[in-house]
């Protein structure tokens, strides 16, 4: 169950999709990717306060145990719930080819 | 690709499966779960240094961008890669029932 979407920490502070612009050099891809030369990387960033966008039962347990034992059990973490595919034009041993990556860009986020 | 399983921070410091013992009270389940009265919760805890157990391309990107922009992009996070099911004996409006939860106990871990 995706729990509450209301962020008690204030607007934009909780787990959500962010876009970070990155060059091929930033990503360490310059030696094997030809295009795009810049990627709009969508990623999940933000806090996961109690029951905010809890992905599943495990996330709810983690929230409860983190409250009890904060030094032992970390709070849930903001990670992708699903991905958008992206195509890269890349160099290979046999020449230039296209490759679609299904797990490159975050589509939406949850806490786990 | 699950990248390196060698932890550069020392034994047991990186993302791995831990077991945390929790009572129904700890979990906030005392009013609806009858059994078990204590749960051995398996969860994913630990650091995710560069490329350690990187779940996918997104995790690799996150590592690269965290290195470049640590204040903006968080490091990858240690989360379940899969789950073990668990059955609970629970109270319902119509009496006692069994319910299997597929997303309660972490089975193994990766960084994302």
């Amino acid at each position: 169950a995706r729990n509450g979407d209301h962020c008690p920490l204030g607007p934009g502070r909780c787990c959500r999709l962010h876009t970070v612009r990155a060059s091929l050099e930033d990503l360490g891809w310059a030696d094997w990717v030809l295009s795009p030369r810049e990627v709009q990387v969508t990623m999940c960033i933000g806090a996961c306060p109690s029951q905010f966008r809890a992905a599943n039962m495990h996330a709810q347990i983690k929230t409860s145990l983190h409250r009890l034992k904060p030094d032992t059990v970390p709070a849930p973490c903001c990670v992708p719930a699903s991905y958008n595919p992206m195509v890269l034009i890349q160099k290979t041993d046999t020449g230039v080819s296209l490759q679609t990556y299904d797990d490159l860009l975050a589509k939406d986020c949850h806490c786990i | 690709a699950r990248n390196g399983d060698h932890c550069p921070l020392g034994p047991g410091r990186c993302c791995r499966l831990h077991t945390v013992r929790a009572s129904l009270e700890d979990l906030g389940w005392a009013d609806w779960v009858l059994s078990p009265r204590e749960v051995q919760v398996t969860m994913c805890i630990g650091a995710c240094p560069s490329q350690f157990r990187a779940a996918n391309m997104h995790a690799q990107i996150k590592t690269s961008l965290h290195r470049l922009k640590p204040d903006t992009v968080p490091a990858p996070c240690c989360v379940p890669a899969s789950y073990n099911p668990m059955v609970l004996i629970q109270k319902t409006d119509t009496g006692v029932s069994l319910q299997t939860y597929d997303d309660l106990l972490a089975k193994d871990c990766h960084c994302i």
């Epitope: 030809l34 295009s35 958008n84 595919p85 992206m86 195509v87 034009i89 230039v96 296209l98 | -």
Partner: antibody, heavy 118, light 108 residues
Framework: QVTLKESGPGILQPSQTLSLTCSFS??????????VSWIRQPSGKGLEWLAL???????RYNPSLKSRLTISKDASSNQVFLKITSVDTADTATYYC??????????WGQGTLVTVSA | EIVLTQSPALMAASPGEKVTITCSVS???????LHWYQQKSETSPKPWIY???NLASGVPVRFSGSGSGTSYSLTISSMEAEDAATYYC?????????FGAGTKLELK
């Protein structure tokens, strides 16, 4: 395996509207970076780029024809469409549909011959 | 718009001969935005060289590309019969996307 197939009326008369369909398989137009272009080639002549549509519905047109061109897509049914209004004999050509990821004409359809004749 | 001028328009080469086709661009572009395509008669064009010098998958290694700014070239180190075709340069630096008029390479 990527395939693209163009379909059109074959023959039409001056002043009519040309409607072309590109049906493709082996890739998705919902994939970030993916695009589909239309290019035409009159018999024995060179290549002329007409229009391009990307995954995010960004559309680009050749300004010399822009007022007559409309490109659209139905990503769910793997189809891209091109309409050219007010055709005349100069629009007689083979029309190609091309998979266009980012900045490359990567896979070309076999082409469909369109003849404008009175 | 960016104009691409290819030369020669038509040429013939013997098997084993070195062949160079040039593409002159009307304004300077990044080498990553200059591509080449091969077209044989009655067939669709095929991508041949991406970003000035990167051979498309399956293109024989006797082909190479080079250049920068406004001057680019495609070279065949040793002509073979299957290389007879028309070659087009194309820029993806700015819209409208444009092609050269083509160089028709025949086997002598």
């Amino acid at each position: 395996q990527v395939t693209l197939k163009e379909s059109g009326p074959g023959i039409l008369q001056p002043s009519q509207t040309l409607s072309l369909t590109c049906s493709f398989s082996g890739f998705s137009l919902s994939t970030s970076g993916m695009g589909v272009s239309w290019i035409r080639q009159p018999s024995g002549k060179g290549l002329e780029w007409l229009a391009l549509i990307y995954w995010d519905d960004d559309k680009r047109y050749n300004p010399s024809l822009k007022s007559r061109l409309t490109i659209s897509k139905d990503a769910s049914s793997n189809q891209v469409f091109l309409k050219i209004t007010s055709v005349d004999t100069a629009d007689t050509a083979t029309y190609y549909c091309i998979q266009s990821p980012w900045d490359w004409f990567a896979y070309w359809g076999q082409g469909t011959l369109v003849t404008v004749s009175a | 718009e960016i104009v691409l001028t290819q030369s020669p328009a038509l040429m013939a080469a013997s098997p084993g001969e070195k062949v160079t086709i040039t593409c002159s661009v009307s304004s300077s572009i990044s080498s990553s935005n200059l591509h080449w395509y091969q077209q044989k008669s009655e067939t669709s064009p095929k991508p041949w060289i991406y970003g000035t010098s990167n051979l498309a998958s399956g293109v024989p290694v006797r082909f190479s590309g080079s250049g920068s700014g406004t001057s680019y070239s495609l070279t065949i180190s040793s002509m073979e019969a299957e290389d007879a075709a028309t070659y087009y340069c194309q820029q993806w630096s700015s819209y409208p996307l444009t092609f050269g008029a083509g160089t028709k390479l025949e086997l002598k």
